[in-house]
Interface confidence: low
């Protein structure tokens, strides 16, 4: 007869490992007992369990509650066992020794490989600000056995670098993603992708990029100067900018205090019916935690009567 087993049995951490050992004997042969032992190099053999044809399963105290026979129906020539809830420490060489009658003893070895799926973690880098050079956006670390693969999935242009640290039973891989921050990256996803033979599918952790910036400020509302005449109602100036974090706005007048009746509403400066006292230089100050910007405009409120008077003069002069 002969023993049938596997060279390597691979399980994921926490799964049950079936250690196969089947005696394919001639007609009339019987299996008296099957002894399982762990036989790592240089450490001798340690009994795991013994399946006895008469007395049943005996389990070593070190493996109490963790070694079982496969569920019935069972073939009397099948000496396979289940090692419950495999852990990293179970990884190694195992030997199955079958005592048969009348053919004698047979033995075979297999290697148990325990895959430890990684538990990836993503750590954002320092705050990103427009104008910085190459900056760490995020690092992603995954530890497992064997070493996991760590890559990045993103539309953002950047560079990656990886390093790995070997531990006694696992390896930790860290990949860093560096980029040159720009405002166009705001809200863009940066996804760490971890691959490993112990995972049914890649694990993905997504980090949303936040880049601090503040755009140049400009003021809208003076496009048609002729609209800024005495008596006009609803005149307003609007300050235009954008930023991350969203900026706050402040209005001042360069040549004095804001005239009475002028309303400040965030980015908008609202005027009451215009008078000449509304003429002046107005400054919009935009700021966020990243930076600040100013934009100033000159308001010149026209007096239609003055204009028409000049026109009459011009006509009479001709």
């Amino acid at each position: 007869g002969e023993l049938e087993t596997s060279d390597v049995v691979t399980v994921v951490l926490g799964q049950d490992a079936k250690l196969p050992c089947f005696y394919r004997g001639d007609s009339g042969e019987q299996v008296g007992q099957v002894a399982w032992a762990r036989v790592d190099a240089g450490e001798g053999a340690q009994e795991l369990a013994l399946l006895h044809s008469k007395y049943g399963l005996h389990v070593s105290p070190a493996y109490e509650g963790r070694v079982e026979q496969p569920p019935p129906p069972r073939n009397p020539l099948d000496g396979s066992v289940l090692l419950r809830n495999a852990v990293q420490a179970d990884e190694g060489e195992y030997e199955c020794r079958v005592s048969t009658f009348p053919a004698g003893s047979f033995q075979a070895r297999l290697r148990l490989r325990v895959l430890v799926p990684p538990l990836p973690s993503l750590n954002p880098g320092p705050a990103l600000e427009e104008g910085q050079g190459l900056t760490l956006a995020a690092s992603c670390t995954a530890e497992g056995s064997p070493a996991p693969s760590v890559t990045w999935d993103t539309e953002v242009k950047g560079t990656t670098s990886s390093r790995s640290f070997k531990h006694s039973r696992s390896a930790a891989v860290t990949s860093e993603f560096h980029l040159v921050p720009s405002r166009s990256m705001n809200g863009q996803p940066l996804t760490c992708v971890v691959s490993h033979p112990g995972l049914l599918q890649d694990q993905r952790i997504t980090h949303i990029l936040h880049v601090s910036f503040l755009a140049e400020a400009s003021v809208r509302g003076l496009e048609d100067q002729n609209l800024w005449h005495i008596g006009r109602e609803g005149a307003m100036l609007k300050c235009l900018s954008e930023g991350q974090p969203p900026p706050s706005y402040n209005w001042t007048r360069l040549d004095g205090p804001l005239p009475s009746g002028v309303r400040v509403d965030g980015d908008t400066l609202g005027f009451p019916p215009l008078t000449t006292e509304h003429s002046g230089i107005y400054v919009c100050h935009v700021s966020n935690e990243f930076s600040s910007r100013d934009s100033q405009v000159t308001v010149d409120v026209l007096d239609p009567q003055e204009d028409s008077g000049k026109q009459v003069d011009l006509v009479s002069a001709s």
Epitope: Q46, P61, A89, S121, E143, H167, R169, S170
Partner: nanobody
Framework: EVQLVESGGGLVQPGGSLRLSCAAS????????MGWYRQAPGKQREYVAT???????NYADSVRGRFTISRDNSKNTLYLQMNSLRAEDTAVYYC????????????WGRGTLVTVSS
């Protein structure tokens, strides 16, 4: 045999902080994974966090970002820093450790009570 003794539990207001400790009776270098579980009154024991000898950590979603697990192998001690505590964090917190040897064995402490209440 490894004895695990937790300490640091007590009464704390919502939003407050506590630091739990777990002292092991033998070198924690041989304990490949140490961690914390908790059991609220009338509920099943639930996973909180674990840490490997190399310092890699994992957290339950319910505590990620609020709790931090750490270990000092030179002092044979495991820690759990708990910030921004909520009423639902009230539970008995148990320390656990897995011994690296041929037949892996998991050890448990007796637990320490954390009560979050105003």
């Amino acid at each position: 045999e490894v004895q695990l003794v937790e300490s640091g539990g007590g009464l704390v207001q919502p939003g407050g902080s506590l630091r739990l400790s777990c002292a092991a009776s033998r070198s924690t270098f041989s304990l490949n994974i140490m961690g914390w579980y908790r059991q609220a009154p009338g509920k099943q024991r639930e996973y909180v966090a674990t840490i490997t000898t190399g310092g890699s950590t994992n957290y339950a979603d319910s505590v990620r970002g609020r709790f931090t697990i750490s270990r000092d192998n030179s002092k044979n001690t495991l820690y759990l820093q708990m910030n921004s505590l909520r009423a639902e964090d009230t539970a008995v917190y148990y320390c656990t450790a897995e011994l690296v040897r041929r037949g892996p064995t998991t050890y448990w402490g007796r637990g320490t009570l954390v009560t979050v209440s105003s």
